[in-house]
């Protein structure tokens, strides 16, 4: 006759890792006499013998979960009792491993520029999947505007036109990767005036052209108002290019007036409107130029792409409604006018204008634009474009060229900092350094106004003849 023996668990339960929909087994080998009664609990709740999700075999020593679900994770315990001594218990954890699954995929979104867009991407998986996003064919990079939230959703602050496109989210863990469907983010843009009409002071009987440029998606329409009423006289010319509408109102001036340009476009059932006004007066006036603030961003235009340093951060002036488009429009206009100047002058003038309109940003306390160094401005003025500049000054203009009625100013060299005083205060024009080294003959130019601010440094040893008032070194 066997002696009674209290139960002893000879194989304690261990942590079991299991994939969803796979089988998971806990073994609880018990030695005892008489044979024990073995019960199982999950998270301290008894597992019922008749629960069809489980199979309990080998006299209760084997617990099998027939098809693991993500909700099965927890602590499983076997309790053995045969009436001899106390009941014994052994516990182990079930860790449900799960390939990534996108439970709430992103959906197509239409959003108005400047607002916040959130594309959802809720995921499941163990280990917890990391979520990244793809735009078009490229991995999306986070920045100050674009962030992947803890939830996996993509948040875009201050949505821009360039954010439009196809997106998908990617959930990834050690067991695999899941991709959402491609969804489309469409950016609608309120009508906005890029270039407001400029006020004019003219003599009686002059012709004046007021120009108003607007942008929007869809392309806006432009109408003109004169002193609160529809324009009664004058001719209007319009052109549309790349979602930009350009409207020009030509007037014969016999009385002063307030002229308003109204740009309108439609979003669903709603309309958006932008207005800008200009006065035409018959009296003397002076245009005051205020320094305005702006922001630094990579140059994404085309005109100055070859002139500005690759990926350079340049300054965009927020006195314009849409600084990037407005400044590009200005340089585009200037570029066409430069076709008339000499081959010697043109590339130097292009370098000057691009670096003047798209000033290099420097950091420090706040990122701010750096003007061109005076020495380089003078090199363009007195060397590369001496003839053109003299002709221009003879006509009492302050621009390199005329663009219809609009004069685009070039920098006034005397009002620019010298790199000899503070080399970090201004931008050099690498093109001019290159030409200095590579051009063999230049006319000798003598500065008409030597500046006390620029030391008399010796001219370069090459035959690049520099005014004694400044040096290109």
């Amino acid at each position: 006759e066997k002696l009674p023996k209290a139960p002893v668990i000879t194989t304690p339960l261990e942590t079991v890792d299991a994939l969803v929909e796979e089988v998971a087994t806990f073994m609880c080998a018990v030695e005892s006499y008489p044979q024990p009664e073995i019960s199982w609990t999950r998270n301290k709740i008894l597992i019922k013998l008749f629960d069809t999700r489980y199979s309990i075999r080998e006299n209760g020593q084997l617990l099998t979960i027939l098809s693991v679900e993500d909700s099965d994770d927890g602590i499983y315990c076997c309790i053995a009792n045969n009436g001899v001594g106390g009941a014994v218990e052994s516990c182990g954890a079930l860790q449900v491993k799960m390939k990534p699954k996108i439970t709430r995929p992103p959906i197509n979104v239409k959003i108005i520029e400047g607002l916040k867009a959130v594309l959802p991407c809720t995921t499941m998986g163990n280990p917890k999947p990391s979520v990244s996003w793809i735009k078009g064919d490229n991995a999306l990079r986070e920045n100050s505007r674009i962030a992947v939230l803890e939830s996996g959703s993509l948040r875009i602050h201050n949505v821009q036109k360039e954010d439009a496109g196809q997106y998908r989210c990617v959930a990834k863990n050690s067991l695999g990767t899941a991709y959402s469907k491609l969804v489309k983010l469409e950016v609608e843009v309120f009508a906005r005036i890029l270039r407001a009409p400029e006020s004019h002071n003219v003599t009686f009987g002059s012709f004046v052209t007021l120009r108003c440029t607007a942008i929007g998606i869809p392309v806006p329409t432009i109408s003109w108002i004169e002193n609160g009423n529809a324009v009664s006289s004058g001719s209007i010319q319009e052109s549309v290019k790349d979602r930009v509408i350009d409207s020009r109102l030509q007037l014969f001036i016999t009385k002063p007036g307030l002229y308003t340009c109204i740009a309108t476009n439609k979003h669903g059932e709603k309309f958006s409107t932008a207005k800008a006004a200009a006065t035409v007066s018959i009296a003397e006036w002076s245009k005051s130029q205020k320094d305005s603030q702006g922001y630094c961003a990579q140059y994404r235009g085309e005109v100055c792409d070859a002139v500005l340093a690759k990926d350079a951060l340049v300054f965009f002036n927020t006195s314009y409604r849409d600084p990037e488009d407005a400044q590009e429009l200005l340089i585009h206009t200037a570029w066409n006018e430069l076709k008339a100047v000499s081959p010697l002058c043109r590339p130097a003038a292009e370098a000057l204008l691009c670096n003047h309109l798209f000033q290099e940003c420097s950091p420090g306390v706040v990122p701010t634009p750096m003007p061109i160094c005076r020495e380089y401005c003078l090199a363009v003025k007195e060397l590369f474009c001496a003839k053109e500049w003299q002709a221009m000054e003879g006509k009492a203009h302050r621009g390199l060229y005329r663009s219809g009625m609009h004069l685009l100013p070039v920098p006034e060299c005397s009002k620019l900092p010298s790199m000899h005083r503070d080399p970090t205060a201004c931008t050099r024009l690498p093109y001019l350094d290159y030409k200095k080294e590579n051009i063999t003959t230049f006319p000798s130019i003598t500065s008409s106004r030597p500046s006390a601010d620029i030391p008399n440094l010796p001219a370069s040893t090459s035959s690049f003849a520099v005014s004694p008032a400044y040096s290109m070194t």
Epitope: P363, T424, A425
Partner: antibody, heavy 115, light 113 residues
């Protein structure tokens, strides 16, 4: 040649005020950023404030609310108004020309805060 | 704020010897393709003097035995005196101009052996 000449330093009691000046010559003053930097006896350099070409000013946290930088482009002069002075403000105060590098330094003016 | 750490804190050099001073930044000072890290020399009893700006550009009038290195998104910068001279006895400071407040390293004292 660029010259920066500071003045206005002296002995002052804690809680007192002082006005430092820096007269600039040899360059077009209005076109450049100007700074104040100080150096406590036997210690390193500490940047205090900068004023840009539009007279917009920025300060180090240690002096914000107590010191005020200003410029007079007609007189070619940079100023630093020091209020509510503390013993730890005792230092040689330099006027410095420069935007992202401190290019030209004056000889400094001594400020001593002591009771 | 950006913290700059200089090493060594002091060094003794013989005439003609190569001297290397290191400056480590707590974060990148790279902006718009330039490293906004400057080096200054302060001789005993004198005002500081700019030696190097943008990490490696020598200020005009500075002898070519002084050179600065550190490029890309590095946080480690070096000032090298290729052949130490008696007039190079000074304290050398690095300084960042990447963001506010502008900050200096604690300085490296270079003495004549």
């Amino acid at each position: 040649e660029v010259q920066l000449v500071e003045s206005g330093g002296g002995l002052v009691q804690p809680g007192g005020s002082l006005s430092l000046s820096c007269v600039a010559s040899g360059f077009t003053f209005s076109l450049y950023y100007m700074n104040w930097v100080r150096q406590a006896p036997g210690k390193g350099l500490e940047w205090l404030s900068v004023i840009d070409t539009h007279s917009i000013a920025y300060y180090a946290d240690s002096v914000k609310g107590r010191f005020t930088i200003s410029r007079d482009n007609v007189k070619n002069t940079l100023y630093l108004q020091l209020n509510n002075l503390k013993p730890e403000d005792t230092a040689l105060y330099y006027c410095v020309l420069g935007r992202t590098a401190l290019v030209r330094w004056g000889q400094g003016t001594q400020v001593t805060v002591s009771s | 704020e950006i913290v700059l750490t200089q090493s060594p804190s002091s060094v003794t050099a013989s005439i003609g010897e190569k001297v290397t001073i290191n400056c480590e930044s707590s974060q990148s000072v790279l902006y718009n393709q330039k490293n906004y890290l400057n080096w200054y020399q302060q001789r005993p009893g004198q005002s500081p003097r700019l030696l190097i700006y943008w990490a490696s550009t020598r200020q005009s009038g500075v002898p070519d035995r002084f050179s600065g290195s550190g490029s890309g998104s590095t946080t480690d910068f070096t000032l090298t005196i290729s052949s130490f001279q008696p007039e190079d006895v000074a304290v050398y400071y690095c300084q960042q101009a990447y963001n506010a407040p502008l900050t200096f390293g604690p300085g490296t004292k270079v003495e004549l052996k």
